[in-house]
Amino acid sequence: DVERTTCPPEKEVHEIDESLIFYKKRELEACVDAALLAAQMDRVDAIPFTYEQLDVLKHKLDELYPQGYPESVIRHLGHLFLKMSPEDIRKWNVTSLETLKALLKVSKGHEMSAQVATLIDRVVVGRGQLDKDTVDTLTAFCPGCLCSLSPERLSSVPPSVIGAVRPQDLDTCGPRQLDVLYPKARLAFQNMSGSEYFVKIRPFLGGAPTEDVKALSQQNVSMDLATFMKLRREAVLPLTVAEVQKLLGPHVEGLKVEEQHSPVRDWILKQRQDDLDTLGLGLQGGIPNGYLILDLSVREALS
């Protein structure tokens, strides 16, 4: 913490300008009025303050706004944003996409994923839902940031907005997030023809249930292995060899290359070796011929 001293008369600050870069930390603390700083935040980013000096300015704002900064200040934080912790950001109420854009630009190239995720969360809360304008801003200024949102926040995306989401925006989404987004995408693209539908739904298929994957296998979609590998393990395991062959089409030979990676490995273990042999790929590890499969989980559920 910066020690308290009184401000020398000749150092009194009446406006935020470049002369402040020559102030020592304790002089900034003593001489800069927090209310003046807040009122002239738009000037701060143009002044080449050191990181130590920025620490003092942040401390000033923290004292003035213990419950969180107002958006008029947040919008003009500039490089001062780099000093914010997720805990600081959690106190904010942000509704303006201009504020979001400004801070996303500042954070680019810095290790600030936790701060950015919290900021986006505050924007979604502030705006009430993840609307098209917010999604467009995220895809333009922060590809992949959509996946920093919790499944609960993503549930506020209207299906009509899903079309604005690009494949690369979903690259870092986990299974729980795709579980939320997939039904919305299915709804958004339901009126499209088979091939067009598959192109659109492909990035969301990590959230698809088995019955939807089975349905795709009847539509000659020729799913690539990259997409197949992103399917939920639970969605892949019940598929038969014939269904997987139909689903992958000419890409089925890729199973050989990926046979040691999940979910391919787990799926192989559930198939009869006889059935796997029909693919002619030399896949090994299936259930030997003549073995009886007892599904004990079904028996437990009945007892």
Partner: antibody
């Protein structure tokens, strides 16, 4: 432009560990596995293993089992290869190479990272 | 593991000549799962041919590949000065993936 950019050269003592990074750009990171291949001075190429960035799943060449660990960071499109208990015969150039999931050929390679193990 | 043996170890030829490089596998390789790479001194390897005979993007048509089972061939119909390098075959038909020991094509 598709690029794989690796971390700089390393000099390590026997018994130490080395962690090499490979940052991908210009393509959908999770549509390709990342494999690691090494080349000892004046020698041929040796496959070490791969990682699926989508699932984080790994396969290692048994020759390196227990010594090699591959990890990924989807947020930065970066893959890491750590080799532990280094010995002099681990002196080599280590390459990351992109492999489209479902194929086995490497269509883009990193520039290589020289690791020297010497006491 | 499948051992890939490349022959000859060194091939001394002049520009304009035809180069034939062999790759022999210790057990059968599915032809879809064999590729060839070129490596020049101080550079990373570069994909030339995949799935035995498919030319990779940007590779000139003077390169071609053929073969099946245990025997595979890379042919350069007419050597250009930039073709003098080391060539490796590679299989992913069986785990672990393996490379051949390489054939060095040098200027005679």
């Amino acid at each position: 432009e598709v690029q794989l950019v690796q971390s700089g050269a390393e000099v390590k003592k026997p018994g130490a560990s080395v962690k090499v990074s490979c940052k991908a750009s210009g393509y959908t990171f999770t549509d390709y596995n990342m494999d690691w291949v090494r080349q000892a001075p004046g020698q041929g190429l040796e496959w070490m293993g791969d990682i699926n960035p989508s699932t984080g799943g790994t396969i290692y060449n048994q020759k390196f089992n227990g010594r090699v660990t591959m990890t990924e960071d989807k947020s930065t499109s970066t893959v890491y290869m750590e080799l532990s208990s280094l010995r002099s015969e681990d002196t080599a150039v280590y390459y990351c190479a992109r492999r489209r999931i479902g194929t086995g050929y490497f269509d883009v390679w990193g520039q290589g990272t020289t690791v020297t193990v010497s006491s | 593991e499948i051992v890939l043996t490349q022959s000859p170890a060194t091939l001394s030829l002049s520009p304009g000549e035809r180069a034939t490089l062999s790759c022999s596998a210790s057990s059968s390789v599915i032809s879809s799962y064999l590729s060839w790479y070129q490596q020049k001194p101080g550079q990373s390897p570069r994909l030339l041919i995949y799935r035995t005979s498919n030319l990779a993007s940007g590779i000139p048509a003077r390169f071609s590949g053929s073969g099946s089972g245990t025997d595979y061939t890379l042919t350069i119909s007419s050597l250009e000065p930039e073709d003098f390098a080391v060539y490796y075959c590679h299989q992913w038909s069986s785990f672990p993936y393996t490379f051949g020991g390489g054939t060095k094509v040098e200027i005679k």
